[in-house]
């Protein structure tokens, strides 16, 4: 109409998908009677009548809005339920009297996208690629309108950068009218990006204002060539024979190159390749002194066939050789002297110790042990221990047995044994001496003899208890070239008064033997009974 003012901007109504939009007809009473209003939707500049109000009563027109419109607020407001993205358009109300006026409402529809789904290139990115490669994708599903995407690296937004960073975004419209956004980050990465954290952020608007959603952070597999190769040895520190030693080849490239480990041969001055396991680790188990030497690692890039060599590493497997003692089998007369000398080789300084075998008592710190005025009790074992003090657990020992010449020496002179008539008795008798004695018994029975050690012998006799035996007792005699000696076993009948209340529950036979050095008693083997007195 000529001279009429330009149409005012429509009123803005913002709603989320699925909610109800309240379209309030803003005509004043002077502009029209709200009890007689027509509502139109405008799409691509085409008006479609969707609702009529007559005498305050509403009536939907057939079509897409038929089921979703109702009147509220005494007819002044049209409610549109279950809003969809397709509802984003202009709605207008037109009053009929006194003259036709209209009021326009712009409906804006919003929907937050789902959490962004970020995916990393499953094959990884080589740093030497000629062009930017697809690093990761970010997908934001079912948003409205189209959200904006921002990529971040280590918390900083990524900007387009010619030939270095390119962000390629596209969207698809779902049947619901919602948008799915896909953004592809293409970049030329460098070695330092191997630890970089990437994520994407979706920025979107709702009636309540601006919002954003972040994806999880991801790292990208970055491939870069090896520049440096080195060897690592485990365990660190001083190594000793018997240890499990791992020699590992390491490189700063990804993926790791193919490795080979070689050891220098001192005699041929050539490197000999060692057999590694599947991970390229050389395992020395148990480590021996022969494993000592100069090791090197060679790394091969199988694509370029270029090889790199590590710095050589000296490996020292510390050892102690077999310990030698001289004399090796010493024999001495009582009252004489003896010097025992211990020798061993090692890769480190050695400490020597002499110990008494039976008691572990330290007799001497040093390689030489001097013994004077030897007594019979001095016979037995002496142990030389050669150890490296700086390496715990690195030691070798050698045992030597000293024999003192002398006639047989009994473990006990006499003993009382409790017996029952007609029982089979198991008696034992122990003697020592040098030369080693033999033992005989003065009664018939089954005797067996066993060496306890080169100077000591134990004889056992199985015999039936008879009245005669009870009367005479039993004697064992030990003899060697230098003399003889006898022990007596007195047999005593058990009577009930000697039994304790619980002793009848013990029916097993037991044997106990004692060392002659402590002059403890050797017992016969029989029903275990209380000891009526000390045996001497």
């Amino acid at each position: 109409v000529p001279g009429e003012a330009e149409q005012p901007a429509p009123e803005l109504v913002e709603v989320e998908v699925g909610s109800t939009a309240l379209l309030k007809c803003g005509l004043s009473q002077s502009q029209g009677n709200l009890s007689h209003v027509d509502w139109f939707s405008v799409h691509k500049e085409k008006r479609t009548l969707i609702f009529r109000v007559r005498q305050g009563q509403g009536q939907s027109e057939p079509g897409e809005y038929e089921q979703r419109l109702s009147l509220q607020d005494r007819g002044a407001t049209l409610a549109l339920t279950q809003v969809t993205p397709q509802d984003e358009r202009i709605f207008l109300c037109q009053g009929k009297r006194p003259r036709s006026q209209e009021y326009r409402i712009q409906l804006r529809v919003y929907k937050a996208p789902e959490e962004p789904n970020i995916q990393v290139n499953p094959l990884g990115i080589p740093v030497n690629s000629k062009e930017p490669e697809e690093v990761a994708t970010c997908v934001g599903r079912n948003g409205y309108p189209i959200p904006q995407v921002i990529w971040y690296k280590n918390g900083r937004p990524l900007k387009e950068e010619k030939n270095r960073v390119h962000i390629q975004s596209s969207q698809t419209v779902e049947s619901s009218g919602l948008y799915t956004l896909q953004s592809i980050l293409k970049a030329q990465l460098v070695k330092e990006d191997k630890d970089a954290q990437f994520y994407c952020e979706l920025n979107y608007r709702l009636p309540s204002g601006n919002h954003m959603k972040e994806s999880r952070e991801v790292t990208v597999p970055v491939f870069y060539p090896t520049e440096k190769v080195w060897l690592e040895v485990e365990p660190v520190g001083m190594l000793k024979e018997g240890d499990r030693v791992e020699i590992r080849c390491l490189a700063d490239g990804n993926p790791p190159p193919h490795f080979s480990i070689s050891k220098g041969n001192p005699s041929t001055r050539e490197a000999e390749e060692e057999t590694t396991n599947d991970n390229g680790v050389l395992v020395l188990e148990p480590a021996r002194k022969e494993h000592s030497g100069r090791y090197e690692c060679q790394a091969w890039n199988l694509d370029t066939m270029i090889s790199l060599l590590s710095e050589p590493q000296e490996l020292l497997v510390n050892y102690v050789s077999d310990v030698r003692v001289s004399p090796a089998a010493p024999e001495r007369q009582e009252g004489s002297s003896l010097t025992l000398t211990c020798e061993a080789e090692s890769s480190q300084d050695l400490e020597f110790q002499w110990l008494r075998e039976e008691t572990d008592q330290v007799l001497e710190r040093g390689p030489v042990l001097q013994l004077h005025d030897l007594k019979r009790e001095a016979g037995g074992g002496y142990r030389c221990v050669a150890s490296v003090p700086s390496i715990p657990g690195l030691n070798r020992t050698q045992l030597v047995k000293l024999a003192i010449f002398g006639p047989p020496w009994m473990a006990f002179k006499e003993r009382k044994v409790w017996v029952k008539e007609n029982m089979v008795l198991n008696l034992s008798c122990e003697a020592s001496g040098h030369p080693r004695p033999t033992i005989s018994w003065n009664v018939n029975g089954t005797a067996s003899e066993g060496d306890q050690d080169p100077q000591r012998v134990l004889s056992t006799l199985n015999v039936l208890v008879t009245p005669e035996l009870l009367e005479t007792g039993v004697e064992c005699t030990a003899s060697n070239d230098l003399g003889k000696n006898t022990s007596i076993l007195f047999l005593e009948l058990v009577n009930l008064t000697t039994l304790t209340p619980d002793s009848n529950t013990t029916t097993g036979l037991s044997t106990s033997t004692a060392s002659p050095h402590t002059r403890a008693n050797s017992t016969s083997t029989e029903r275990k009974l209380p000891e009526p007195e000390s045996r001497g």
Partner: antibody, heavy 116, light 106 residues
Framework: QVTLKESGPVLVKPTETLTLTCTVS????????VSWVRQPPGKALEWIAA???????YYNSAFKSRLTISRDTSKSQVVLTMTNMDPVDTATYYC??????????WGQGTLVTVSS | DIQMTQSPSSLSASVGDRVTITCKGS??????LAWFQLKPGKVPKLLIY???SLQTGIPSRFSGSGSGTDFTLTISSLQPEDVATYYC????????FGGGTKVEIK
């Protein structure tokens, strides 16, 4: 529309080299990566190798030393060579387009038999 | 390498039945999973990508669900043309496929 077609020999002898060609249309090799996948008779699918839109090459470490993948962008072709063929390499060989990380279009495959 | 275990290896169902195939990853692969349909002599077909997104042109009776290590392909109403072998594939780290599920009509 997007199509991929594999071509190459149907029969190769043990120890020989296999050369397969994948000819693509409906997209550019500088926009999408292409992979080779195989399926031995009665067995599952197995990824072999890929070449990216930027020309970077990737191989399954199980065959790495035997494989070469290359492309000719002007001919829209991706070529796979596999040396030292063995009867266990008898399979249907497919090429597939990446979009960008999953395979959205495949060729119909070519059956390669390794036998003397 | 990530292993994908698919079950069952085969199944037989009637037309109209709801069919479910599962795929389990040896580690978390988030939503980097696709489902394919293979028919002898035909071009393999992408059904589902990103675990639950239906590829354009695929009937809506196919659907995918799951994330992390456990995934499912569902055919809501089995049709005769759905007879095929179905494979899952992870693309989180490298590419590995499940062992396949052969679907037949009873």
């Amino acid at each position: 529309q997007v199509t991929l077609k594999e071509s190459g020999p149907v029969l190769v002898k043990p120890t020989e080299t296999l050369t397969l060609t994948c000819t693509v249309s409906g997209f550019s090799l500088t926009s999408n990566a292409v992979s080779w996948v195989r399926q031995p008779p009665g067995k599952a699918l197995e990824w072999i190798a890929a070449i990216s839109s930027g020309g970077s090459t990737y191989y399954n470490s199980a065959f790495k030393s035997r494989l070469t993948i290359s492309r000719d962008t002007s001919k829209s072709q991706v070529v796979l060579t596999m040396t030292n063929m063995d009867p266990v390499d008898t399979a249907t060989y497919y090429c597939a387009r990446h979009r960008p990380f999953y395979f959205d279009y495949w060729g119909q495959g070519t059956l390669v038999t390794v036998s003397s | 390498d990530i292993q994908m275990t698919q079950s069952p290896s085969s199944l037989s169902a009637s037309v109209g039945d709801r069919v479910t195939i599962t795929c389990k990853g040896s580690q978390n692969i988030y939503k980097s999973l696709a489902w394919f349909q293979l028919k002898p002599g035909k071009v393999p077909k992408l059904l589902i990508y990103d675990a639950n997104s239906l590829q354009t042109g695929i009937p809506s009776r196919f659907s995918g669900s799951g994330s992390g290590t456990d995934f499912t392909l569902t055919i809501s109403s089995l049709q005769p043309e759905d007879v095929a072998t179905y494979y899952c594939q992870q693309y989180y780290s490298g590419y590995t496929f499940g062992g396949g599920t052969k679907v037949e009509i009873k």
